[in-house]
Protein backbone atom coordinates (compact mmCIF):
# COMPACT_ATOMS: atom_id res chain seq x y z
CA UNK A 1 0.00 0.00 0.00
CA UNK A 2 1.28 3.45 -0.90
CA UNK A 3 1.31 5.53 2.27
CA UNK A 4 3.68 8.29 1.23
CA UNK A 5 2.87 11.89 0.47
CA UNK A 6 4.76 14.47 -1.55
CA UNK A 7 5.27 17.94 -0.14
CA UNK A 8 6.14 20.59 -2.71
CA UNK A 9 6.76 24.31 -2.84
CA UNK A 10 3.23 24.60 -4.23
CA UNK A 11 2.53 27.77 -6.21
CA UNK A 12 5.60 29.98 -6.58
CA UNK A 13 6.50 33.09 -8.49
CA UNK A 14 9.81 34.47 -9.64
CA UNK A 15 11.21 37.33 -11.68
CA UNK A 16 12.09 37.09 -15.33
CA UNK A 17 15.84 36.59 -15.63
CA UNK A 18 16.09 35.22 -12.13
CA UNK A 19 16.31 31.65 -10.85
CA UNK A 20 14.15 29.37 -8.76
CA UNK A 21 14.62 26.14 -6.87
CA UNK A 22 12.05 23.45 -7.58
CA UNK A 23 11.89 21.05 -4.69
CA UNK A 24 9.75 18.18 -3.48
CA UNK A 25 9.97 15.94 -0.47
CA UNK A 26 8.53 12.47 -0.02
CA UNK A 27 7.36 11.70 3.50
CA UNK A 28 5.29 9.17 5.46
CA UNK A 29 6.85 6.16 3.79
CA UNK A 30 9.90 3.99 4.32
CA UNK A 31 10.11 3.30 0.60
CA UNK A 32 13.52 3.79 -1.00
CA UNK A 33 13.71 6.60 -3.54
CA UNK A 34 15.51 5.18 -6.56
CA UNK A 35 14.98 8.07 -8.97
CA UNK A 36 13.29 11.46 -9.32
CA UNK A 37 12.17 12.70 -12.73
CA UNK A 38 11.45 16.39 -13.26
CA UNK A 39 8.96 17.22 -16.01
CA UNK A 40 7.27 20.28 -17.41
CA UNK A 41 4.04 19.32 -19.16
CA UNK A 42 5.23 16.54 -21.51
CA UNK A 43 8.89 17.54 -21.48
CA UNK A 44 11.56 15.92 -19.38
CA UNK A 45 13.83 18.48 -17.70
CA UNK A 46 16.06 16.19 -15.69
CA UNK A 47 16.44 12.86 -13.94
CA UNK A 48 18.25 12.25 -10.68
CA UNK A 49 19.01 8.56 -10.21
CA UNK A 50 20.35 7.53 -6.81
CA UNK A 51 23.07 5.40 -8.41
CA UNK A 52 23.60 6.80 -11.89
CA UNK A 53 23.56 10.48 -10.99
CA UNK A 54 21.98 13.22 -13.11
CA UNK A 55 20.60 13.42 -16.62
CA UNK A 56 19.83 16.91 -17.88
CA UNK A 57 17.76 17.19 -21.05
CA UNK A 58 19.86 18.88 -23.75
CA UNK A 59 17.22 21.53 -24.41
CA UNK A 60 17.58 22.70 -20.79
CA UNK A 61 21.27 22.09 -20.18
CA UNK A 62 22.20 25.77 -20.22
CA UNK A 63 19.43 26.78 -17.83
CA UNK A 64 19.02 23.87 -15.43
CA UNK A 65 21.40 22.98 -12.62
CA UNK A 66 21.21 19.77 -10.59
CA UNK A 67 20.18 20.12 -6.98
CA UNK A 68 20.13 21.05 -4.22
CA UNK A 69 19.58 17.43 -3.24
CA UNK A 70 16.93 15.87 -5.42
CA UNK A 71 15.68 19.31 -6.41
CA UNK A 72 16.31 21.32 -9.52
CA UNK A 73 17.47 24.90 -10.04
CA UNK A 74 15.93 26.66 -13.02
CA UNK A 75 17.94 29.69 -14.17
CA UNK A 76 17.56 32.61 -16.59
CA UNK A 77 13.80 32.42 -16.27
CA UNK A 78 11.56 33.62 -19.07
CA UNK A 79 7.80 34.14 -19.10
CA UNK A 80 7.59 30.96 -21.20
CA UNK A 81 8.73 29.02 -18.12
CA UNK A 82 5.39 29.78 -16.48
CA UNK A 83 3.43 26.58 -15.98
CA UNK A 84 3.19 23.28 -14.15
CA UNK A 85 6.23 21.28 -13.09
CA UNK A 86 6.09 17.72 -11.81
CA UNK A 87 8.44 15.78 -9.58
CA UNK A 88 7.96 12.06 -10.18
CA UNK A 89 9.43 9.91 -7.44
CA UNK A 90 10.25 6.33 -8.41
CA UNK A 91 10.36 4.31 -5.21
CA UNK A 92 10.80 0.73 -4.10
CA UNK A 93 8.61 -1.03 -3.21
CA UNK A 94 5.81 1.57 -3.30
CA UNK A 95 5.98 2.61 -6.95
CA UNK A 96 5.54 6.14 -8.29
CA UNK A 97 4.54 9.32 -6.46
CA UNK A 98 3.94 12.61 -8.26
CA UNK A 99 4.09 16.15 -6.91
CA UNK A 100 3.03 19.33 -8.67
CA UNK A 101 4.50 22.84 -8.57
CA UNK A 102 3.05 25.83 -10.40
CA UNK A 103 5.60 28.46 -11.36
CA UNK A 104 4.64 31.94 -12.50
CA UNK A 105 7.40 34.02 -14.02
CA UNK A 106 6.63 37.72 -13.73
CA UNK A 107 7.93 40.63 -15.78
CA UNK A 108 7.69 42.89 -12.74
CA UNK A 109 10.61 43.40 -10.40
CA UNK A 110 8.18 43.12 -7.51
CA UNK A 111 7.61 39.42 -8.05
CA UNK A 112 7.04 37.73 -4.73
CA UNK A 113 9.15 34.69 -4.34
CA UNK A 114 7.69 31.67 -2.57
CA UNK A 115 9.48 30.80 0.64
CA UNK A 116 12.47 28.58 0.07
CA UNK A 117 11.45 25.01 0.75
CA UNK A 118 13.79 23.13 3.03
CA UNK A 119 14.11 19.37 3.15
CA UNK A 120 14.10 18.39 6.82
Amino acid sequence: MMTGTIETTGNISAEKGGSIILQCHLSSTTAQVTQVNWEQQDQLLAICNADLGWHISPSFKDRVAPGPGLGLTLQSLTVNDTGEYFCIYHTYPDGTYTGRIFLEVLESSVAEHGARFQIP
Epitope: D42, L44, D51, H55, I56, S57, H90
Partner: antibody
Framework: EVQLVQSGAEVKKPGSSVKVSCKAS????????IHWVRQAPGQGLEWIGG????????IYNQIFRGRATLTVDKSTSTAYMELSSLRSEDTAVYFC????????????WGQGTTVTVSS | DIQMTQSPSSLSASVGDRVTITCKAS??????VVWYQQKPGKAPKLLIY???YRFTGVPSRFSGSGSGTDFTLTISSLQPEDFATYYC?????????FGGGTKVEIK
Protein backbone atom coordinates in the same frame (compact mmCIF):
# COMPACT_ATOMS: atom_id res chain seq x y z
CA GLU B 1 40.43 9.57 -28.01
CA VAL B 2 37.94 7.72 -25.82
CA GLN B 3 38.51 3.97 -25.88
CA LEU B 4 36.98 1.03 -24.06
CA VAL B 5 38.98 -2.16 -24.58
CA GLN B 6 37.46 -5.42 -23.37
CA SER B 7 39.01 -8.76 -22.48
CA GLY B 8 38.97 -11.71 -24.86
CA ALA B 9 36.40 -14.38 -25.58
CA GLU B 10 35.54 -16.93 -22.88
CA VAL B 11 34.13 -20.46 -22.95
CA LYS B 12 32.53 -21.52 -19.68
CA LYS B 13 30.73 -24.50 -18.21
CA PRO B 14 27.17 -24.21 -16.92
CA GLY B 15 27.14 -23.25 -13.24
CA SER B 16 30.50 -21.49 -13.39
CA SER B 17 31.30 -17.76 -13.40
CA VAL B 18 32.88 -15.37 -15.86
CA LYS B 19 34.56 -12.02 -15.26
CA VAL B 20 34.86 -9.62 -18.19
CA SER B 21 37.11 -6.56 -18.00
CA CYS B 22 36.86 -3.19 -19.73
CA LYS B 23 39.83 -0.82 -19.72
CA ALA B 24 38.94 2.82 -20.27
CA SER B 25 41.24 5.50 -21.64
CA UNK B 26 41.07 8.96 -23.17
CA UNK B 27 38.88 10.54 -20.47
CA UNK B 28 38.60 11.00 -16.71
CA UNK B 29 37.35 7.61 -15.57
CA UNK B 30 35.48 8.77 -12.46
CA UNK B 31 33.40 11.31 -14.38
CA UNK B 32 31.35 8.82 -16.38
CA UNK B 33 29.11 5.89 -15.48
CA ILE B 34 30.03 2.55 -17.04
CA HIS B 35 27.14 0.39 -18.20
CA TRP B 36 27.03 -3.21 -19.32
CA VAL B 37 24.79 -4.47 -22.12
CA ARG B 38 24.55 -7.93 -23.60
CA GLN B 39 23.37 -9.36 -26.91
CA ALA B 40 22.50 -13.02 -27.39
CA PRO B 41 23.21 -14.48 -30.85
CA GLY B 42 20.81 -12.98 -33.40
CA GLN B 43 18.95 -11.12 -30.66
CA GLY B 44 18.52 -7.56 -29.43
CA LEU B 45 20.23 -5.60 -26.68
CA GLU B 46 19.66 -6.12 -22.96
CA TRP B 47 20.83 -3.73 -20.22
CA ILE B 48 22.58 -5.46 -17.32
CA GLY B 49 23.33 -2.47 -15.11
CA GLY B 50 25.62 0.44 -14.44
CA UNK B 51 28.42 1.46 -12.09
CA UNK B 52 29.09 5.07 -11.12
CA UNK B 53 32.79 5.39 -10.25
CA UNK B 54 32.20 8.86 -8.83
CA UNK B 55 30.44 7.55 -5.75
CA UNK B 56 30.53 3.76 -6.27
CA UNK B 57 26.80 3.62 -6.98
CA UNK B 58 25.72 0.39 -8.61
CA ILE B 59 22.40 -0.36 -10.24
CA TYR B 60 21.26 -3.68 -11.71
CA ASN B 61 18.52 -4.86 -13.97
CA GLN B 62 16.44 -7.01 -11.58
CA ILE B 63 16.74 -10.04 -13.84
CA PHE B 64 20.49 -10.06 -13.17
CA ARG B 65 20.38 -9.11 -9.50
CA GLY B 66 22.23 -11.66 -7.41
CA ARG B 67 24.08 -13.08 -10.43
CA ALA B 68 25.81 -10.01 -11.89
CA THR B 69 28.42 -8.03 -9.98
CA LEU B 70 29.77 -4.76 -11.33
CA THR B 71 33.02 -3.38 -9.94
CA VAL B 72 35.81 -1.02 -10.95
CA ASP B 73 39.48 -0.53 -10.24
CA LYS B 74 39.96 3.22 -10.35
CA SER B 75 43.75 2.94 -10.21
CA THR B 76 43.78 1.24 -13.62
CA SER B 77 40.54 2.78 -15.01
CA THR B 78 39.12 -0.69 -15.47
CA ALA B 79 35.54 -1.86 -15.05
CA TYR B 80 34.53 -5.46 -14.45
CA MET B 81 31.35 -7.44 -14.91
CA GLU B 82 31.13 -10.83 -13.23
CA LEU B 83 28.24 -13.16 -13.99
CA SER B 84 27.77 -16.27 -11.87
CA SER B 85 25.67 -19.45 -12.09
CA LEU B 86 26.04 -19.39 -15.84
CA ARG B 87 23.52 -21.15 -18.06
CA SER B 88 23.34 -21.69 -21.80
CA GLU B 89 21.02 -18.66 -22.17
CA ASP B 90 23.89 -16.46 -20.97
CA THR B 91 25.77 -17.17 -24.21
CA ALA B 92 26.07 -13.67 -25.64
CA VAL B 93 28.35 -10.81 -26.55
CA TYR B 94 28.85 -8.57 -23.51
CA PHE B 95 29.54 -4.87 -24.09
CA CYS B 96 30.79 -2.24 -21.69
CA UNK B 97 29.66 1.27 -22.52
CA UNK B 98 30.23 4.75 -21.20
CA UNK B 99 27.42 7.17 -20.39
CA UNK B 100 27.85 10.75 -21.53
CA UNK B 101 28.25 13.34 -18.78
CA UNK B 102 24.89 14.54 -17.41
CA UNK B 103 23.24 12.48 -20.13
CA UNK B 104 21.73 9.00 -19.92
CA UNK B 105 22.97 8.02 -23.38
CA UNK B 106 25.72 5.49 -23.99
CA UNK B 107 28.15 7.39 -26.19
CA UNK B 108 31.14 5.04 -26.44
CA TRP B 109 31.17 1.24 -26.50
CA GLY B 110 33.74 -1.48 -26.05
CA GLN B 111 34.31 -3.95 -28.87
CA GLY B 112 32.39 -6.68 -27.06
CA THR B 113 33.40 -9.93 -25.37
CA THR B 114 31.89 -13.20 -26.53
CA VAL B 115 30.96 -15.52 -23.67
CA THR B 116 29.95 -19.05 -24.64
CA VAL B 117 28.34 -21.28 -22.03
CA SER B 118 28.50 -24.92 -23.04
CA SER B 119 28.95 -28.28 -21.36
CA ASP C 1 9.34 -2.69 -16.89
CA ILE C 2 8.73 -0.44 -19.87
CA GLN C 3 8.47 -2.29 -23.17
CA MET C 4 9.77 -0.63 -26.32
CA THR C 5 8.18 -1.95 -29.50
CA GLN C 6 9.86 -1.16 -32.80
CA SER C 7 8.30 -1.41 -36.22
CA PRO C 8 8.92 -2.69 -38.73
CA SER C 9 11.29 -5.42 -37.55
CA SER C 10 12.94 -5.30 -40.97
CA LEU C 11 12.62 -3.33 -44.19
CA SER C 12 14.14 -3.32 -47.63
CA ALA C 13 15.03 0.00 -49.19
CA SER C 14 17.15 1.49 -51.92
CA VAL C 15 19.91 4.07 -51.76
CA GLY C 16 18.28 7.52 -51.76
CA ASP C 17 15.05 6.32 -50.14
CA ARG C 18 13.49 8.03 -47.15
CA VAL C 19 13.24 5.53 -44.30
CA THR C 20 11.13 5.85 -41.15
CA ILE C 21 11.40 3.58 -38.12
CA THR C 22 8.96 3.85 -35.24
CA CYS C 23 9.28 2.97 -31.57
CA LYS C 24 6.35 2.78 -29.18
CA ALA C 25 6.77 2.73 -25.40
CA SER C 26 4.34 0.74 -23.26
CA UNK C 27 3.99 3.78 -20.99
CA UNK C 28 4.94 7.43 -20.85
CA UNK C 29 8.69 8.01 -21.21
CA UNK C 30 8.57 11.76 -21.93
CA UNK C 31 11.51 12.43 -24.25
CA UNK C 32 13.92 9.98 -22.62
CA VAL C 33 14.67 8.00 -25.76
CA VAL C 34 17.92 7.20 -27.54
CA TRP C 35 18.62 5.59 -30.94
CA TYR C 36 21.60 3.37 -31.79
CA GLN C 37 22.93 1.92 -35.04
CA GLN C 38 24.60 -1.48 -35.12
CA LYS C 39 26.39 -3.21 -37.98
CA PRO C 40 27.04 -6.98 -38.00
CA GLY C 41 29.85 -8.02 -35.68
CA LYS C 42 30.27 -4.50 -34.32
CA ALA C 43 29.25 -2.64 -31.18
CA PRO C 44 26.25 -0.30 -31.38
CA LYS C 45 26.91 3.38 -32.05
CA LEU C 46 25.00 6.28 -30.53
CA LEU C 47 22.99 8.15 -33.18
CA ILE C 48 20.28 10.30 -31.61
CA TYR C 49 19.32 11.21 -28.04
CA UNK C 50 16.61 13.08 -26.17
CA UNK C 51 15.14 12.18 -28.85
CA UNK C 52 16.10 14.70 -31.55
CA TYR C 53 19.76 15.56 -30.86
CA ARG C 54 22.35 14.06 -33.17
CA PHE C 55 25.49 12.72 -31.53
CA THR C 56 28.85 14.12 -32.63
CA GLY C 57 29.68 13.17 -36.21
CA VAL C 58 26.24 11.78 -37.06
CA PRO C 59 25.15 13.00 -40.52
CA SER C 60 22.22 15.41 -40.79
CA ARG C 61 20.19 12.89 -42.81
CA PHE C 62 19.43 11.19 -39.47
CA SER C 63 16.72 12.80 -37.39
CA GLY C 64 14.60 11.80 -34.44
CA SER C 65 11.31 13.02 -33.04
CA GLY C 66 8.55 12.13 -30.61
CA SER C 67 7.46 12.48 -27.01
CA GLY C 68 5.36 10.55 -24.55
CA THR C 69 5.03 7.08 -26.04
CA ASP C 70 5.63 7.45 -29.78
CA PHE C 71 9.03 8.04 -31.36
CA THR C 72 10.43 8.09 -34.87
CA LEU C 73 13.87 7.77 -36.43
CA THR C 74 14.06 9.08 -40.00
CA ILE C 75 16.83 8.69 -42.56
CA SER C 76 16.05 11.29 -45.18
CA SER C 77 18.14 9.80 -47.98
CA LEU C 78 19.50 6.32 -47.35
CA GLN C 79 23.20 5.87 -48.04
CA PRO C 80 25.08 2.57 -48.59
CA GLU C 81 26.70 2.84 -45.13
CA ASP C 82 23.27 3.13 -43.45
CA PHE C 83 22.33 -0.51 -44.01
CA ALA C 84 22.36 -1.76 -40.42
CA THR C 85 20.11 -2.57 -37.47
CA TYR C 86 18.64 0.31 -35.47
CA TYR C 87 17.58 0.15 -31.82
CA CYS C 88 15.61 2.54 -29.66
CA UNK C 89 16.15 2.64 -25.90
CA UNK C 90 14.35 4.35 -23.03
CA UNK C 91 16.04 5.74 -19.92
CA UNK C 92 12.95 7.23 -18.30
CA UNK C 93 13.03 4.55 -15.63
CA UNK C 94 15.17 1.55 -14.76
CA UNK C 95 15.66 -1.04 -16.00
CA UNK C 96 16.67 0.69 -19.20
CA UNK C 97 15.05 -1.21 -22.05
CA PHE C 98 15.62 -1.49 -25.78
CA GLY C 99 13.35 -2.06 -28.72
CA GLY C 100 13.72 -5.32 -30.61
CA GLY C 101 15.57 -3.65 -33.47
CA THR C 102 14.83 -2.76 -37.08
CA LYS C 103 17.06 -4.26 -39.75
CA VAL C 104 17.44 -2.03 -42.81
CA GLU C 105 18.42 -4.15 -45.80
CA ILE C 106 19.27 -3.39 -49.42
CA LYS C 107 16.37 -3.84 -51.84
Amino acid sequence: EVQLVQSGAEVKKPGSSVKVSCKASGYTFTEHVIHWVRQAPGQGLEWIGGFNPNHDGTIYNQIFRGRATLTVDKSTSTAYMELSSLRSEDTAVYFCTRAAKLLFAMDYWGQGTTVTVSS
Amino acid sequence: DIQMTQSPSSLSASVGDRVTITCKASQHVSNAVVWYQQKPGKAPKLLIYSPSYRFTGVPSRFSGSGSGTDFTLTISSLQPEDFATYYCQQHYSTPWTFGGGTKVEIK
